[in-house]
Structures are given as C-alpha cells and as structure tokens.
C-alpha cells in the first residue's frame, strides 16, 4: 500500500515571537527515503527542514526521529516572525539520484498574529 503523509491541521495561528508545532505523521517508512518540510509549492518552494544531518536555525524535530520505527515527523518553529507565514508541506521522498518526491501532506497554513 502506498505511504500516506498526514498533516492533520489545515491551519495554525501563532503570535509573533512565539513557537508553533506543525504536525506530520506517515503511515509507513517505506519506500526508504528522506522526509522534508517545505514552505510553498513548485520551483520556488523553500526548504524549511530535512530529517538528515543538516541543521536549520529555529526549526527542530518534535519527536526522536532516530527511532527506527518513528513515523512522527512533526517540527517546531521557534521565535516566529511575520515572514514565516505561508503554507507548509511535509513531503516524503523515495531514495534515488536525485531523490524523487512520492507523497506530500495536504499542507498547513501558518498565520502569524501581531503581538
């Protein structure tokens, strides 16, 4: 059965300066390949977080993604600014050269409220 990427919240609101959690769960880890978070769609989408060895300021994983059975790929964005507003997608890739996108979550829109 094909892996599904579940983003349960269609939108979240967060006050500037606060942190927010964007939830994402997978129904399977197979086929093997990375999971990445993007803001926006298409060619101009911005990589927000990758569950590899890379480091991303202000963005951390919520659960212990080093668990071999982990299916929770939620992230926390800290010290949110108005520039962080947008729709965030959790995306599953199949390994390859380059990796191939096989499934995306439905997206979670982040609204940033003035403090």
């Amino acid at each position: 059965t094909e892996v599904k990427v579940i983003q349960p919240e269609k939108s979240v609101s967060v006050a500037a300066g606060d942190s927010t959690v964007l939830n994402c769960t997978l129904t399977s880890l197979l086929p093997v390949g990375p999971i990445r978070w993007y803001r926006g769609v298409g060619q101009s989408r911005q990589l927000i977080y990758s569950f590899t060895t890379e480091h991303f300021p202000r963005v951390t994983n919520v659960s212990d993604a080093t668990k071999r059975s982990n299916l929770d790929f939620s992230i926390r964005i800290s010290n949110v600014t108005p520039e962080d507003a947008g729709t965030y997608y959790c995306v599953k890739f199949q390994r390859g050269s380059p990796d191939t996108e096989i499934q995306s979550g439905g997206g979670t829109e982040v609204y940033v409220l003035a403090k």
Partner: antibody, heavy 118, light 107 residues
Framework: DVQLVESGGGVVRPGESLRLSCAAS????????MSWVRQAPGKGLEWLAG????????YYIDSVKGRFTISRDNPKNSLYLQMSSLTAEDTAVYYC???????????WGLGTLVTVSS | ALTQPASVSANPGETVKITCSGG??????YAWYQQKSPGSAPVTVI????KRPSDIPSRFSGSASGSAATLIITGVRVEDEAVYYC???????????FGAGTTLTVL
C-alpha cells in the same frame, strides 16, 4: 573532530559478564543514534545492537537478544554494552559507531578487544 | 544477506568497481566501509548509497539500483588497498547487515 573511544575490553571466562563503554566527543551526542559492531578474529563485521538518540528504543540482532544490553548516558556522552553469559564465540574486537539519519554508520571507534577463554 | 566478491585487483590508475547484491531497493540503504587491516577501525567511504563524507577523496563514489549497490574507485591508488565491506540498513526489519568483505589488491 568526531571521536569515539571504546574501553572495558579484556579477558574473561565463559559464562562471565563484561561492560563495554564508548566515550564520545566532537559532536552533539544526544542528537545521534548509536550502535555496537563486532569483528571476530579473521571474520567480517557483525552489527549487534543500536539505540535511539534519546535512549528509549533499542534494537538487537537475534543472536545476542537477552544476553546483551545497549544503553547510553547522554549527559556523560557515553554509550554502553552490557554483555552476559559470554562464550568463546563472543571473542572479538567491539566497535561503537555513530549512525547517520538512515541508520548506516559514519564514524567508528578504534575498538576494544574482548577475549573469552577458560 | 549481502553478497560481494571475495577479492578484486587492479593496477594503479585503473577504475575499480565492487558490487554488493541481496538488498531490496524498496527498503535497503547501502554504505561502504574500508578496513586497512583486521581489527583496525573501519572508515566510512560511502553512506546513503552515494554520499561521500567530507574527508574521503573524490575518487570514491557509490550508486545503488535494483537490488545492488556499487562502490567505484576512479584512479585507484596503492593506499586504497584494504578490505571493503558493503553494509545495509533494512527499513522493513530495522536490522543492519554487512557483506563478507572484498579484498582490494593494487598491483
């Protein structure tokens, strides 16, 4: 620089126990899963056990389940392998290794020799 | 089980390919580990199929397709003599495995 230094090896008798340690430095230890791998004399590499970064999840090869226990102390930047009911077949060099995001290995320790002999 | 040739040999400057078969492309990631003498610390030359650690020379590369992975050494050197172990992680079983090792001799 990433450094992994094993200790605790030595000569023990069959049936005895031993605890190996691995001291980690040069990286954020609490962010990485870790594993133990061994190499018997004249043989190849054999993965034994792995542990998640937080220490809550452990994984073992069938042949050591129930005899070996992997654990870690993140504040001490240390990884452990508790071995019991040792037999001559457990004689090997034991390596600790840091895992990549997909549970392969990117850094290895120098190893510690365990000899089980009567 | 991962299967690789017991030995390969080459002259300096030649290209060496070592294959590793037996994994499932759907569930297995591959790595290659170099061991210059028995009991010495292995060195990772390739992980995640084709990722080369920053301190590994660019003559080492890797690929994977179907049920096999390949380590390629382009312009092999005498100092590349070693045993090369293919390693795999199976996301279905959560288990790591190794091939039996390939002894590379540079003539």
């Amino acid at each position: 620089d990433v450094q992994l230094v094993e200790s605790g090896g030595g000569v023990v008798r069959p049936g005895e126990s031993l605890r190996l340690s691995c001291a980690a430095s040069g990286f954020t230890f609490s962010s990485y899963a870790m594993s133990w791998v061994r190499q018997a004399p004249g043989k190849g590499l054999e993965w034994l056990a792995g542990i998640s970064a937080g220490g809550s999840d452990t994984y073992y090869i069938d042949s050591v389940k129930g005899r070996f226990t992997i654990s870690r102390d993140n504040p001490k930047n240390s990884l452990y392998l508790q071995m019991s009911s040792l037999t001559a077949e457990d004689t090997a060099v034991y390596y600790c290794a840091r895992e990549t995001w997909n549970h392969l290995f990117d850094y290895w320790g120098l190893g510690t020799l365990v000899t089980v002999s009567s | 089980a991962l299967t690789q040739p017991a030995s390969v040999s080459a002259n300096p400057g030649e290209t060496v390919k070592i294959t590793c078969s037996g994994g499932d492309y759907y569930s297995t990631y591959y790595a290659w580990y170099q061991q210059k003498s028995p009991g010495s610390a292995p060195v990772t030359v390739i992980h995640s199929d084709d990722k080369r650690p920053s301190d590994i020379p660019s003559r080492f590369s890797g690929s994977a397709s179907g049920s096999a992975a390949t380590l390629i050494i382009t312009g092999v050197r005498v100092e590349d003599e070693a045993v090369y172990y293919c390693g795999g992680y199976d996301g279905r079983t959560y288990i790591n495995t190794f091939g039996a090792g390939t002894t590379l001799t540079v003539l």
